[in-house]
Interface confidence: medium
């Protein structure tokens, strides 16, 4: 029996469409597939950022694949052809690997890129990113932010920069339609008359950087002689009630009594008849049902009851 062989795919390349990290990997069918006309050829694609220990592996019948990468590092990929066992009367046949790499030739020394990039999606409504200028860069250096997510035709530049001493140090984003639960890509590059500036690339998902508004309208209600119900309302905005976790801090007679995390807008507290003062604050965070991560809101305004014996009155602030 002659050994069945197959060639690797042709013209394997990584194409950058200008989406700040979302790249196309594409290829053409291997040469000499005439023997296997009745066969559906498959391709095994492996790719990673250079320096990563693990490869991502995809098996596909298509001639392209798209995914997001960290453009601060290079990318390497390899692909080979697979002939399923149905085509070869027995075992699967694999071609040799075709390999390719891609990287953006870095300009400037690493110290010139922006420092301490921080992005917060306030109340799941307003995205704000801020940064510090690179180390030792001159005041003539200015930074520009570009962003892209799936659904935009092309990368967009920030139109509302936050400035300090004439330098851009942040961006207030416009309304970002249908932008959550997908990768959000940012590039901050820079220009200076004196020296080249290193670009920085960032990728995150907006629902994971949400900082909600604090809860509002805190109230007390006497439930029984030894129980008080603390209650509050979710802040206005697009975040549904099911997406909140709350942290409560309760002080009884100036002593920290309880810190608790709860999933709904009430908390029942056991008290004694001797309690003279009760204060509590609440803060909110998007929970694990709606995001993988989040930022605690600021604490609500403190709500207190003092003076009258708590057991004698219904407490509706």
């Amino acid at each position: 029996d002659t050994e069945i062989k197959v060639n690797p795919p042709q013209d394997f390349e990584i194409v950058d469409p200008g989406y700040l990290g979302y790249l196309y990997l594409q290829w053409q069918p291997p040469l000499s597939l005439d023997h296997f006309k009745e066969c559906t050829v498959e391709y095994e694609l492996k790719y990673r950022n250079i320096g990563s220990e693990t490869w991502k592996t995809i098996i596909t019948k298509n001639l392209h694949y798209k995914d997001g990468f960290d453009l601060n590092k290079g990318i390497e990929a390899k692909i080979h052809t697979l002939l399923p066992w149905q085509c070869t009367n027995g075992s699967e046949v694999q071609s040799s690997w075709a390999e390719t790499t891609y990287w953006i030739s870095p300009q400037g020394i690493p110290e010139t890129k922006v420092q301490d990039m921080d992005c917060v999606y306030y109340n799941w409504q307003y995205l704000l990113c801020s940064w510090k200028p690179g180390i030792g860069v001159l005041l003539d250096t200015n930074y520009n932010l570009f962003y892209w997510y799936e659904g935009l035709d092309h990368a967009l530049q920030c139109v509302d920069y936050i400035k300090a001493d004439g330098q851009n140090i942040g961006c207030r984003f416009p309304y970002l339609e249908a932008s959550d639960y997908k990768d959000f890509y940012i590039c901050v590059n820079g220009s200076s008359e004196n020296k080249p500036i290193r670009s920085s690339y960032f990728t995150f998902q907006l629902q994971n950087i949400v900082k909600p508004l604090p809860p509002v309208y805190l109230t007390f209600t006497r439930e029984s002689s030894c129980e008080i119900k603390l209650k509050w309302s979710i802040p206005l905005g697009p975040i549904p009630a099911r997406c909140f976790d709350y942290e409560i801090e309760i002080r009884e007679d100036d002593t920290t009594l309880v810190t608790a995390t709860v999933e709904n807008e009430t908390y029942t507290l056991k008290t004694t008849n001797e309690t003279r003062q009760l204060c509590f604050v609440v803060r909110s965070k998007v929970n694990i049902y709606c995001s993988d991560d989040g930022i605690w809101s600021e604490w609500s305004d403190k709500q207190c009851w003092e003076g009258e014996d708590l057991s004698k009155k219904t407490l509706l602030r």
């Epitope: 409504q125 509002v216 309208y217 206005l236 905005g237 697009p238 305004d301 403190k302 207190c304």
Partner: antibody
Framework: QVQLVQSGAEVKKPGSSVKVSCKAS????????MNWVRQAPGQGLEWMGR????????DYNQNFKDRVTITADKSTSTAYMELSSLRSEDTAVYYC????????????WGQGTLVTVSS | DIVMTQSPDSLAVSLGERATINCRAS??????????MNWYQQKPGQPPKLLIY???RQGSGVPDRFSGSGSGTDFTLTISSLQAEDVAVYYC?????????FGGGTKLEIK
């Protein structure tokens, strides 16, 4: 608990001015907007303006044609409303009223200050 | 200015029955997906009390029988089962644009 305590009733001559105070307690004064609303005898409510004590930002109802001035003193947690060029139709109860933000309504009101304008 | 028109001017309802008050704005009071519409109750000799904010959210300590609905220009305050202590004047108010404006009020009485 939250309290807004207003200054006492006033009787004023037409053409004069009145300044009503509103002392806030039981909450962080600078975290809430302070509104001023008036109500003529037997009539409805009329919003006069508001101040954000945090940064001093003020919005007025232009119907008062520059006759109203709203101020706030963070150090004493007190808001003030001054109405000048008084006329008889300014006779009303004037309320200060706390609001968390524009979409949250006005959740605490002062007891009201009756200003009577009469010659 | 946004003009708020309330109807009816007065309303008499039997104890335990449903009371419905309507408010229409001269233009939409919605923004950012929120309706900037609030409802207040005022009893004689007292300042108003916030019942409903953002069209449908209850203020602090407001009984569950009070509810609000609507969006855009048309809004409704509903008292599901009228109690004696609900006799008052009810006002709607928009806070989308300065100047904030109130409806003319609806006087609710017991039949």
């Amino acid at each position: 608990q939250v309290q807004l305590v207003q200054s006492g009733a006033e009787v004023k001559k037409p053409g004069s001015s009145v300044k009503v105070s509103c002392k806030a307690s039981g909450y962080t004064f600078s975290n809430y907007l302070m509104n001023w609303v008036r109500q003529a005898p037997g009539q409805g409510l009329e919003w006069m303006g508001r101040i954000d004590p945090y940064d001093g930002d003020i919005d007025y109802n232009q119907n008062f044609k520059d006759r109203v001035t709203i101020t706030a003193d963070k150090s004493t947690s007190t808001a003030y409303m001054e109405l000048s060029s008084l006329r008889s139709e300014d006779t009303a109860v004037y309320y200060c009223a706390r609001g968390y933000g524009t979409a949250y309504g006005v959740d605490y009101w002062g007891q009201g200050t009756l200003v009577t304008v009469s010659s | 200015d946004i003009v708020m028109t309330q109807s009816p001017d007065s309303l008499a309802v039997s104890l335990g029955e449903r009371a419905t008050i309507n408010c229409r704005a001269s233009e939409s009071v919605d923004n950012y997906g929120i309706s900037f519409m609030n409802w207040y109750q005022q009893k004689p000799g007292q300042p108003p009390k916030l019942l409903i904010y953002a069209a449908s959210r209850q203020g602090s300590g407001v009984p569950d029988r009070f509810s609000g609905s609507g969006s855009g220009t048309d809004f409704t305050l509903t008292i599901s089962s009228l109690q004696a202590e609900d006799v008052a004047v009810y006002y709607c108010q928009q806070s989308k644009e300065v100047p904030w404006t109130f409806g003319g009020g609806t006087k609710l009485e017991i039949k």
